[in-house]
């Protein structure tokens, strides 16, 4: 009889075991375990009748189609075999064991005791057959195995081979290289690759396979396994396979499909091709004069582009438009998209106007083209170039006038200070009672007319000031305060201030420049009681043009000592005394002034201690502070107080030979002007240089103009 066993392990014994087995007996045990397992059989006891080639009693172990072993006897001999320690292993998941005894037994034989168990098959090690083994990676588990693929590959539906996803390759460049996946390594199995070359209409694709060409083939049948097919419109070229590459293919089309198919077997290196677009050729190009064409090629075909550029200092000119470069393209009909432009020399055009300066051409015919040269200069002697630069500008390749120091910026012409167009007289001889000033001797002298209409009746008064720049006048603070209150400092409104410059004879205002005020700035610490910090500025509404009669004075260096004792300085003024007149009357008539024509006096600086003592000895509260200095003569004389309030006391600077405003006419003693030992008191300007620059919004000590350096 037959026993079916399906467990994963079990025990099989001869009938009657451990007693002797009966004669004429036959039992078959069919063991079946799941797929992925095999059956291991071994015997713990074996005692059967022995016979030649186990003809009488035996145990036979077999699978569906082969006998694995036949056992009998008690010991192994030449003609019979006992299992002993031997293990019988089924190749698959089925094993059949048959026990048979013949009709007679001379002795008593106890039979056998066998055990079986299911054991895992390591398919990864055992599957040699390419058709069954994993393409890339094999993973064993109890009862089975599975396959996986390298990065970039996909497991085929057969769960064994590794294919690639290569159906979506688009090539749009005019040249390129296409290869089988993983080239030059063997290409993947079970893959369907599609490569599309899609170029612009007008191109024709040429294909060229390279030396290595290795696609699985068959000796008789053309390309049954793996192949390449090339589809051009409705036409299909191929299939191609084997080891000989196809000849170059001129597709005559701008659109090509390359199909590559591989089956589930084989190890072949694949293929590589290069493609390039061919198009209609365009005529040869000649670069323009003073220009070049890039890239420079022997031939140009459809879609080739060239860039036309010009030599340094030249610009591409196309349709009257200047540009740096111009691009043209070879069209599909074999013509160029545009004509070659010309190269035109760069023109910097007329140079910009320089305020207070002029420009001269260094190049003949006043040329303004590339490498032409111009020179800016300032209107000397009234203006000088800032930083003393050369003023030479060259027409650059960019079409801009360029200076080595300033680049494209124009130079700055700053007012020259302290250098009258007429030389001031020597400072040796004393001038008694003042002397007429020649026009242009004191070009910084300003007449300040204040008409305070905020009071009824209107208040009107006059003072002097000194021009510091085209827009700023330096004067005394007391000139620019509302006069009707001696206890408070209320600046006059800017609308009430008029400044006259270039005025010489008050009867003749034709040559004078008059300007209204944009700002009135009194020193914040001006003290009305003792006239300490008696300094102020007026910003003019419009900058004044400089000339022989209108030029600024220089500011001194910042030095607390001020001018040295006994140094001679000059003060100019009209000595205006009668205010009960209109502005026009004062400007046009000399009858109400001490002098119609500007007067000047020469005065020595008085030692500070002497001046202080002179005022302290007087009745009244007079204070000569460190912000003041005195000038005049011990014995007095009219000239000591000729100048108008706010006027400049100027001294010639030895180093720079420029006139410097060291003082501003501020105040004097109560006695009649010119009395003995009544010195004029002046604001010490050198204490205020920083403040002045700060108000004018300029850097300290900029030169020329401004501060003596």
């Amino acid at each position: 009889h037959t026993v079916e066993l399906n467990d994963m392990f079990g025990q099989i014994q001869s009938p009657g075991y451990p007693d002797s087995y009966p004669s004429d007996s036959e039992v078959t045990w069919n063991i079946t375990v799941p797929d992925g397992f095999r059956i291991k059989l071994y015997f713990m006891h074996f005692n059967l009748e022995s016979s030649y080639l186990c003809e009488y009693d035996y145990v036979k172990v077999e699978t569906e189609d082969q006998v694995l072993a036949t056992f009998c006897g008690r010991e192994t001999t030449d003609t019979e075999q006992t299992p002993g320690q031997e293990v019988v292993l089924s190749p698959g998941s089925f094993m059949s064991i048959t026990f048979r005894s013949d009709f007679s037994n001379e002795e008593r034989f106890t039979g056998f005791d066998a055990h079986y168990m299911a054991v895992d098959v390591d398919e990864c090690k055992e599957r040699e057959d390419e058709e069954l083994s994993c393409d890339h990676y094999c993973h064993n588990y109890i009862g089975g195995y599975y396959c996986s693929c390298r990065f970039g590959y996909i497991l085929h539906t057969d769960n064994r081979t590794c294919r690639v996803e290569c159906s979506d390759n688009l090539f749009t460049q005019r040249t390129g290289v296409i290869t089988s996946p993983d080239f030059p390594n063997p290409y993947p199995k079970s893959s369907e690759c599609l490569y599309t070359i899609e170029l612009e209409e007008g191109f024709m694709v040429n294909l060229q396979f390279e030396d290595i060409f290795d696609i699985e083939d068959h000796p008789e049948v053309p390309c049954p396994y793996d192949y390449i097919k090339i589809k051009v419109g409705p036409k299909v070229l191929g299939p191609f396979c084997g080891e000989k590459a196809p000849e170059p293919i001129n597709t005559q089309s701008h659109s090509v499909l390359i199909l590559f198919h591989s089956d589930n077997s084989g190890e072949n290196r694949g293929w590589r091709l290069s493609y390039r677009a061919a198009g209609n050729e365009c005529p040869e190009l000649q670069p323009p004069v003073h220009g070049k064409i890039e890239p420079s090629q022997a031939k140009y075909s459809f879609k080739d582009q060239v860039l036309i550029s010009c030599d340094t200092g030249y610009k591409v000119l196309k349709d009257n438009v200047e540009m740096d470069t111009f691009q043209i393209e070879c069209l599909k009909d074999g013509t160029w998209s545009n004509k070659i432009p010309t190269c035109k020399i760069v023109d910097c055009r007329a140079p910009g106007e320089l305020e207070h300066g002029l420009v001269t051409f260094s190049t003949r015919n006043n040329l303004t083209t590339y490498k032409s040269e111009i020179r800016y200069s300032c209107q000397e002697p009234y203006y000088k170039m800032l930083n003393n630069i050369t003023g030479i500008y060259t027409c650059s390749a960019q079409g801009v006038w360029m200076n080595k120091v300033l680049g494209r910026s124009l130079p700055t012409c700053l007012p020259e200070c302290g250098q009258p167009s007429r030389s001031l007289p020597s400072l040796v001889k004393r001038i008694i009672g003042g002397r007429n000033a020649e026009p242009g001797l004191f070009p910084w002298q300003a007449l300040i007319v204040v008409e305070d209409t905020s009071r009824v009746p209107n208040d009107k008064w006059f003072g002097s000031g000194a021009l510091l720049s085209e827009s700023w006048i330096l004067t005394a603070a007391h000139v620019l305060r509302s006069q009707r209150r001696d206890t408070t400092v209320i600046p006059v409104s800017k609308e009430h201030v008029t400044v006259y410059l270039g005025l010489h004879d008050v009867r003749d205002k034709s040559g004078a420049v008059n300007s209204s005020a944009a700002r009135v700035v009194l020193h914040p610490d001006f003290n009305i009681q003792n006239y300490n910090h008696d300094i102020a500025l007026v910003q003019l509404q419009e900058p004044v043009p400089l000339g022989p009669h209108v030029m600024p004075v220089c500011l001194p260096r910042l030095e607390p000592e001020g001018p040295s004792p006994h140094m001679l300085g000059l003060v100019a003024g009209w000595g205006i005394s009668n205010p009960n007149v209109t502005v026009d009357e004062i400007i046009s008539s000399g009858t109400r002034t001490l002098s119609d024509v500007l007067q000047y006096v020469k005065l020595p600086v008085v030692p500070h201690a002497e001046c202080k003592t002179s005022y302290e000895s007087r009745s009244g509260n007079y204070s000569v502070t460190e912000n003041m200095f005195c000038a005049g003569y011990y014995e007095g004389g009219k000239d000591t107080c000729l100048g108008d309030s706010g006027g400049a006391f100027v001294i010639l600077d030895d180093l720079s030979q420029r006139w410097v405003v060291q003082g501003l006419v501020s105040w004097g003693g109560p006695e009649e002007c010119g009395s003995k030992q009544v010195y004029g008191v002046y604001t010490k300007v050198s204490n205020y240089v920083d403040w002045v620059w700060e108000q004018m919004g300029s850097p300290q000590g900029r030169a020329p103009g401004g501060t003596v350096s």
Partner: antibody, heavy 113, light 112 residues
């Protein structure tokens, strides 16, 4: 015609405040100082201070710094003087004056409980 | 403060007579910049506001009869009425505006 029109007489209690107005016409109000003057019988005239309406600049007599405050409304051409912490000593006629030449009609203030 | 002293404090004159009244200041009222003397004379008739007669010590305000004359300089000033009229009955005040303005105590003019 140039005129300064002052507000009417005021009767207030001690400790209170009062604001006297002065409306100008016939000239450019913003460009001229307005002064305020106090007159008490037997005490003559006393200058309180002034304001320039266009800029708002003010100048006070030290004696009235904590008593009077000047303001100006250029849209209505009116100057104001506010007097605070009133006492019977503040009873007087107050004049506004256009920078010395033209006087208002005066406002009589009586401080009494 | 600048003290202004007016004399006499009152006077009585007949119509047509000449009258002078004085005003002294405790310091000079001459401004050295404007060269002006900041002294004014005012007339206050009974029940009226003061009215400007003279400014800058000697300049007559427009519309003021020429019988009124201001004079003086520095610290001593005078108002003269050359021929007194009945309508000149008033208190006359001097005022300085050289510094913080101050008024004189007034001179009361009565007509006999």
């Amino acid at each position: 015609e140039v005129q300064l029109q002052q507000s009417g007489a005021e009767l207030v209690k001690p400790g209170a405040s009062v604001k006297i107005s002065c409306k100008a016409s016939g000239y450019t109000f913003t460009g001229k100082w307005i002064e305020w003057v106090k007159q008490r019988p037997g005490h003559g005239l006393e200058w309180i201070g002034e304001i320039l309406p266009g800029s708002g600049s003010t100048d006070y007599n030290e004696r009235f710094k904590d008593k009077a405050t000047f303001t100006a409304d250029t849209s209505s051409n009116t100057a104001y003087m506010q007097l605070t912490s009133l006492t019977p000593d503040d009873s007087a006629t107050y004049y506004c004056v256009r920078s010395e030449d033209l006087w208002g009609s005066g406002t009589t203030l009586t401080v009494s409980s | 403060d600048v003290v202004m002293t007016q004399t006499p404090s009152s006077l009585a004159v007949s119509a047509g007579e000449k009258v002078t009244m004085s005003c002294k200041s405790s310091q000079s009222l001459l401004n050295s910049v404007t060269r002006k003397t900041y002294l004014a004379w005012y007339q206050q008739k009974p029940g009226q506001s003061p009215k400007l007669l003279i400014y800058w010590a000697s300049t007559r305000e427009s519309g003021v009869p020429d019988r009124f004359t201001g004079s003086g300089s520095g610290t001593d000033f005078t108002l003269t009425i050359s021929s007194v009229q009945a309508e000149d009955l008033a208190i006359y005040y001097c005022k300085q505006s050289y510094t913080l303005p101050t008024f004189g105590g007034g001179t009361k003019l009565e007509i006999k």
